[in-house]
Interface confidence: medium
């Protein structure tokens, strides 16, 4: 995410437009407590981080409260008074939405509608992936709201589903992170299952009426 300066690599993640996590990897300063200084506007004074992340007893990152901010984080990583990495980044471009909550499934014959709670901000895609043991890879469908209908399912098959949220690239840019996946949920004949058999079970013979 930023080029290295004096051997410093940084990573920024803006968790759900709530908390910004900046972490650094500085091989040259691996046994040094680097300090993190930041501001949210170009003309403010720098504040020092009050919530450091530690790795092997040394500072390796900072967590910042930054709720619903659409502005720039100016920051400087320092060794004492000497800046080893200074940059400015648009925080929203490193958005990682939270994992979908209250995921529900509504079945109607060969279709299922997957819903969950929409996040409080927009320009997101809600992606449902699903597969049966007969499928070699996950199928995917996504919508602008968490209301995704998947049609053409086989009621006799067991399907695994999971859901995640992605930031729209044309708004947030290409450096965002998808949310973590929701828990996998398994369904067959409109009923929840503990799991789908890894090996496909042979289809039951149809009884003639």
């Amino acid at each position: 995410q930023g080029g290295a300066a004096e051997g410093v690599q940084i990573q920024i993640i803006y968790f759900n437009l709530e908390t910004v996590q900046v972490t650094w990897n500085a091989s040259k300063y691996s046994r040094t407590n680097l300090t993190f200084h930041y501001r949210f506007n170009g003309d403010e004074a720098y504040d020092q981080c009050t919530n450091y992340l530690l790795q092997e007893g040394h500072t390796s990152g900072c967590l910042l409260d930054a709720e619903q901010r659409d502005d720039i984080l100016y920051f400087s990583i320092r060794n004492g008074t000497h800046p080893v990495f200074t940059a400015s980044r648009w925080m929203v471009y490193y958005l990682k939405p939270s994992s979908p909550k209250h995921v529900r499934f509504s079945w109607h014959q060969d279709a299922v509608t997957v819903t969950c709670s929409d996040l409080s901000y927009g320009d997101l895609l809600y992606e449902v992936q699903y597969r049966s043991p007969f499928d070699t890879e996950w199928q995917s469908k996504q919508e602008n709201t968490c209301n995704v209908t998947i049609e053409g399912l086989d009621a006799e098959k067991c399907y695994s589903f999971w859901v995640r949220v992605k930031a729209m690239e044309d708004v947030y840019g290409p450096d965002t992170y998808p949310s973590d996946w929701s828990e996998v949920t398994c369904w067959q004949r409109g009923e929840i299952r503990d799991a789908c058999a890894e090996t496909p079970t042979p289809p039951k013979p149809k009884l003639s009426k």
Epitope: N41, D70, D71, G173
Partner: antibody, heavy 116, light 107 residues
Framework: QVLLKQSGPSLVQPSQSLSITCTVS????????VHWVRQSPGKGLEWLGV???????DYNAAFMSRLSITQDNSKSQVFFNMNSLQSDDSAIYYC??????????WGQGTSVTVSS | DIQMTQTTSSLSASLGDRVTISCRAS??????LNWYQQKPDGTVKLLIY???RLHSGVPSRFSGSGSGTNFSLTITNLEEEDIATYFC?????????FGGGTKLEIK
């Protein structure tokens, strides 16, 4: 179709202010910010500042003391104001739609001459 | 501020040629590099963003490459409508800065 249409004066007196309006269509100012850039023969293209979709601004430090960018979302207009103009502020001024690290659509430009 | 340098200020080529325009950044800007085309009438259009991504509607004869400090824009099979000035711009750190431009002319 994304369009940015600029309107403003072509001649400004030295020490006076420059005001340019950028009227946008095809996108919402509540969703995308707008940048301002100028181009002069002597200094090439210079980034002047940006107004975010939230209405907050960031300015090039070289112009911060005399630059103001505001917007009216309901009218889809962004207003650029620079005061204390001198002859070396003569340039073509552009507004441009912001999309992450880039300006993906530009206005037609406003050619401004500072002269008495 | 990050300085962007386009060492070639003007370039002459024939229709159908392959043309490469280079741009150098004074420090590492990762891949946050964009290319713009300015026509003689002043109209500015985005061609390539994020070093190599083609903006919508831009012909595939345009391509971009590079990372860190060295970048290039390539036009294959040069056409008459490509006569313009090309600018690079870094979007890594404020203030955003531009190269001085490369004016492309037909031989």
């Amino acid at each position: 179709q994304v369009l940015l249409k600029q309107s403003g004066p072509s001649l400004v007196q030295p020490s006076q202010s420059l005001s340019i309006t950028c009227t946008v269509s095809g996108f919402s100012l509540s969703r995308y910010g707008v940048h301002w850039v100028r181009q002069s023969p002597g200094k090439g293209l210079e980034w002047l500042g940006v107004i975010w979709r939230s209405g907050s601004t960031d300015y090039n430090a070289a112009f911060m003391s005399r630059l103001s960018i505001t917007q009216d979302n309901s009218k889809s207009q962004v207003f650029f104001n620079m005061n204390s103009l001198q002859s070396d502020d003569s340039a073509i001024y552009y507004c441009a739609k912001k999309a992450f690290y880039v300006m993906d659509y530009w206005g037609q430009g406003t050619s401004v001459t500072v002269s008495s | 501020d990050i300085q962007m340098t386009q060492t070639t200020s003007s370039l002459s080529a024939s229709l159908g040629d392959r043309v490469t325009i280079s741009c150098r950044a004074s420090q590492d800007i990762s891949i946050y590099l964009n290319w713009y085309q300015q026509k003689p009438d002043g109209t500015v259009k985005l061609l390539i963003y994020y070093t190599s991504r083609l903006h919508s509607g831009v012909p595939s004869r345009f391509s971009g490459s590079g990372s860190g400090t060295n970048f290039s824009l390539t036009i294959t099979n040069l056409e008459e409508e490509d006569i313009a000035t090309y600018f690079c711009q870094q979007g890594n750190t404020l203030p955003w800065t531009f190269g001085g431009g490369t004016k492309l002319e037909i031989k």
